[in-house]
Interface confidence: low
């Protein structure tokens, strides 16, 4: 199998997020509720499903979270746009993996992301977007944890 590479600078994404994390999380009015389930849902993902879950979570952030969030602060908006662009780039790379049939989605992977979508759906749309942005570190930590698995099929 050919290697499935993602040449995105994760450190740059993490830095961008750290700069806005406090401001975003301060707007979260429901701190005792989680959408990404503090990695519980993601912990049980098997190596075989990492690519699919990553693809699905990138789509979750690009198609829903970044679209639903309305940021009035231009400084924060620039950082979010930067993260969104990095995610779009990662999506493009994973699409190539799919074309190489290295990103198959099994039922377990689909179920894991459905839980996250269901959690998101229970919140008022802007509150859900804020919370999901505030939990970006959960997703980023998970990507880092599964780095080797994800980047080499």
């Amino acid at each position: 199998l050919r290697r499935c590479l993602i040449s995105t600078d994760m450190h740059h994404i993490e830095e961008s997020f750290q700069e806005i994390k406090r401001a975003i999380q301060a707007k979260d009015t429901f701190p005792n509720v989680t959408i990404l389930s503090t990695l519980e849902t993601l912990q049980i993902i098997k190596p075989l499903d990492v690519c699919c879950v990553t693809k699905n979570l990138l789509a979750f952030y690009v198609d829903r979270v970044f679209k639903d969030h309305q940021e009035p602060n231009p400084k924060i908006l620039r950082k979010i746009s930067s993260i969104a662009n990095s995610f779009l780039y990662m999506q493009k790379t994973l699409r190539q993996c799919q074309e190489q049939r290295q990103c198959h989605c099994r039922q377990e992977a689909t179920n894991a992301t459905r839980v996250i979508h269901d959690n998101y759906d229970q919140l008022e749309v802007h509150a859900a977007a804020i919370k999901s942005l505030g939990e970006l570190d959960v997703f980023l930590a998970w990507i880092n944890k599964n780095h080797e698995v994800m980047f080499s099929a």
């Epitope: 707007k27 509720v33 829903r64 998101y120 759906d121 229970q122 919140l123 008022e124 749309v125 509150a127």
Partner: antibody
Framework: QEQLKESGGGLVQPGGSLKLSCKAS????????VSWVRQAPGKGLEWIGY????????YYANWVNGRFTISSDNAQNTLYLQLNSLTAADTATYFC???????????????WGPGTLVTVSS | DIVMTQTPASVEAAVGGTVTIKCQAS??????LSWYQQKPGQRPKLLIY???NLASGVSSRFKGSGSGTEFTLTISDLECADAATYYC??????????????FGGGTEVVVK
């Protein structure tokens, strides 16, 4: 004591407009999601719409069709419902109701006003 | 839109008896369901939220159960004061179907 009190109801002609108020006391209205719900005489409860406390976003039942508008004035601790293009079918008691404080139960209503009657008739 | 169907429309029972009211959702609303009690000329009162959680100050004679599309409110040891109309309410939010703040048609409970 936490209370909600609606006002502004009354007799209005078909095609007319009316603005209802919902005054909160004993708590800060801006900390809660609040809905308007109506009840036609002898009929069931019908959800009209909701205003989100954090973003001020408003959501309406599909049947509202742009005729009603929810707004709030945090300084006055008051919620409003603007009723336009009224017909006899809009004759009802209009309640404001506070969403409970839990996010997953955010659209269940733990505090209701006594209601204000709107009668649309010529 | 979510549709909430409540049955029966009316039920009669004796003091000390038990009444069961059913509520069916047109699609899964998980456990996002409330029950309210409303007496003539009064505002509704929250009884149950989250399908089975008793609201503050509500008697344990009221019991909610169910999830998904089928829900039940059971009132045991009926008292005269329980004579009222009971409504179920879905409050499931889905980004695809929007706000599901929909009430059932109501069930009138008559206590003999």
């Amino acid at each position: 004591q936490e209370q909600l009190k609606e006002s502004g109801g009354g007799l209005v002609q078909p095609g007319g407009s009316l603005k209802l108020s919902c005054k909160a006391s004993g708590f800060d209205l801006s900390s809660y999601g609040v809905s308007w719900v109506r009840q036609a005489p002898g009929k069931g409860l019908e959800w009209i719409g909701y205003i989100d406390p954090v973003f001020g976003s408003t959501y309406y039942a599909n049947w509202v069709n742009g005729r009603f508008t929810i707004s709030s004035d945090n300084a006055q601790n008051t919620l409003y419902l603007q009723l336009n293009s009224l017909t006899a079918a809009d004759t009802a008691t209009y309640f404001c109701a506070r969403g409970s404080g839990y996010v997953y139960y955010g659209y269940t209503y733990d505090l209701w006003g006594p209601g204000t009657l709107v009668t649309v008739s010529s | 839109d979510i549709v909430m169907t409540q049955t029966p429309a009316s039920v009669e029972a004796a003091v000390g008896g038990t009444v069961t009211i059913k509520c069916q959702a047109s699609q899964s609303i998980y456990r996002y369901l409330s029950w309210y009690q409303q007496k003539p000329g009064q505002r509704p009162k929250l009884l149950i939220y989250g399908a089975s959680n008793l609201a503050s100050g509500v008697s344990s004679r009221f019991k909610g159960s169910g999830s998904g599309t089928e829900f039940t409110l059971t009132i045991s040891d009926l008292e005269c004061a329980d004579a009222a109309t009971y409504y179920c309410q879905s409050y499931y939010y889905s980004s695809s179907s929007g706000y599901g703040n929909v009430f059932g048609g109501g069930t009138e409970v008559v206590v003999k």
